[in-house]
Interface confidence: medium
């Protein structure tokens, strides 16, 4: 079965910067990746970035840079905008649409006791459906 993993890490150099890493483990080709925060895409979450292998990327503040790391993984750099540090207790979700498998989504967040530079372990648990 295809799986999606999500890692959230705080940058050691800039405490206000976070990076979300997501990857797809499975066969098939990826047609679209959607990163959202606050919940799954379409279920209360709001989009931060959309990455298309051919049409490029589209992102919204506070997302700073969305990019492909490999053919099946992406990273999204975020810039925390205020002292309240909303990223620290926020859920980030990545949805990979692949052909012919369908859509797979998984979520992750920064561990409560995270030291700068420490990332959450990969969580390859699909929390949503295969469309």
């Amino acid at each position: 079965t295809p799986e999606v993993w999500v890692q959230v890490q705080m940058e050691a150099t800039e405490l206000s910067s976070f990076t979300v890493h997501c990857g797809f483990l499975g066969p098939g080709s990826i047609s679209l990746v959607t990163v959202s925060w606050g919940g799954p895409d379409g279920a209360g979450g709001t989009k931060l970035a959309v990455l298309h292998p051919e049409l490029g990327t589209r992102q919204w503040a506070p997302a700073r840079q969305a990019r492909w790391e490999t053919q099946s993984s992406i990273s999204l750099a975020l810039e925390d905008s205020g002292a309240s540090s909303p990223f620290a207790n926020t859920t980030f979700c990545c949805k990979f649409a692949s052909f012919p498998e369908g859509s797979w989504e998984s979520c992750g967040s920064l561990p409560p006791s995270s030291d700068p530079g420490l990332s959450a372990p990969p969580t390859p648990v699909p929390i949503l459906r295969a469309d």
Epitope: K47, L55, Q59, P86
Partner: antibody
Framework: EVQLQQSGPELVKPGASVRISCKAS????????MHWVKQSHGKSLEWIGY????????GHNQNFKSKATLTVDKSSSTAYMEFRSLTSDDSAVYYC????????????WGQGTSVTVSS | DIQMTQSPASLSASVGETVTITCRTS??????LSWYQQKQGKSPQLLVY???TLTENVPSRFSGSGSGTQFSLKINSLQPEDFGSYYC?????????FGGGTKLEIK
């Protein structure tokens, strides 16, 4: 029925700050982004920024980053924008507007709050 | 940042006429464009989003078209209530920007 009710007009002195409120009703406040837009007299619209009430995360137009602070009070479903170090250039009507989470449309707007900066 | 060039800046037309307002963007924004109508002293009202999707309760005489960098809003058979200002806005990532506006006046 979705409604965004903004606070009343403000007359403020140069250098002062002002806080405008936008009370939302008729929908789940934390499920939608809240945007703020400026319109100077007789001019076009200028996007200031937005806040995601679910977690307080914000995004700004860089032109307003040091000028505007966006906050929310989830308990009262109210969004706030504080504008500081006001000058005559900040005299304008300010609107709040709800945006669906897909970033497709800003479908409901407040009635606007007029801010006049004058000594 | 994406620049929005809206034209014409002003337009005079008669009731019953058909008018077209255009919006050009500095970068490809695919279909991520909205059109708003604003009456004097009122808030903007969403007419069209995603370039061509009409908002609920907006009359069918309004239509949006275009993709990439060229967009247009067409109003068939102008009605008295259609006069006012019109703005385009992109939502292809932040910062969102608006066009300079088109003031539609009665001839």
């Amino acid at each position: 029925e979705v409604q965004l009710q903004q606070s009343g007009p403000e007359l403020v002195k140069p250098g002062a700050s002002v806080r405008i409120s936008c009370k939302a009703s008729g929908y789940t406040f934390t499920d939608y982004n809240m945007h703020w837009v400026k319109q100077s007299h007789g001019k076009s619209l200028e996007w200031i920024g937005y806040i995601y009430p679910y977690n307080g995360g914000t995004g700004h137009n860089q032109n307003f980053k040091s000028k505007a602070t966006l906050t929310v009070d989830k308990s009262s479903s109210t969004a706030y924008m504080e504008f500081r170090s006001l000058t005559s250039d900040d005299s304008a009507v300010y609107y709040c507007a709800r945006e669906d989470f897909r970033h497709e449309k800003m479908d409901y707007w407040g009635q606007g709050t007029s801010v006049t900066v004058s000594s | 940042d994406i620049q929005m060039t809206q034209s014409p800046a002003s337009l005079s037309a008669s009731v019953g006429e058909t008018v077209t307002i255009t919006c050009r963007t500095s970068d490809n924004i695919y279909v991520y464009l909205s059109w708003y109508q604003q009456k004097q002293g009122k808030s903007p009202q969403l007419l069209v989003y995603n370039a061509k999707t009409l908002t609920e309760n907006v009359p069918s005489r309004f239509s949006g078209s275009g993709s990439g960098t060229q967009f247009s809003l067409k109003i068939n058979s102008l009605q008295p209530e259609d006069f006012g200002s019109y703005y385009c806005q992109h939502h292809y990532g932040t910062p969102y920007t608006f066009g300079g506006g088109t003031k539609l006046e009665i001839k």
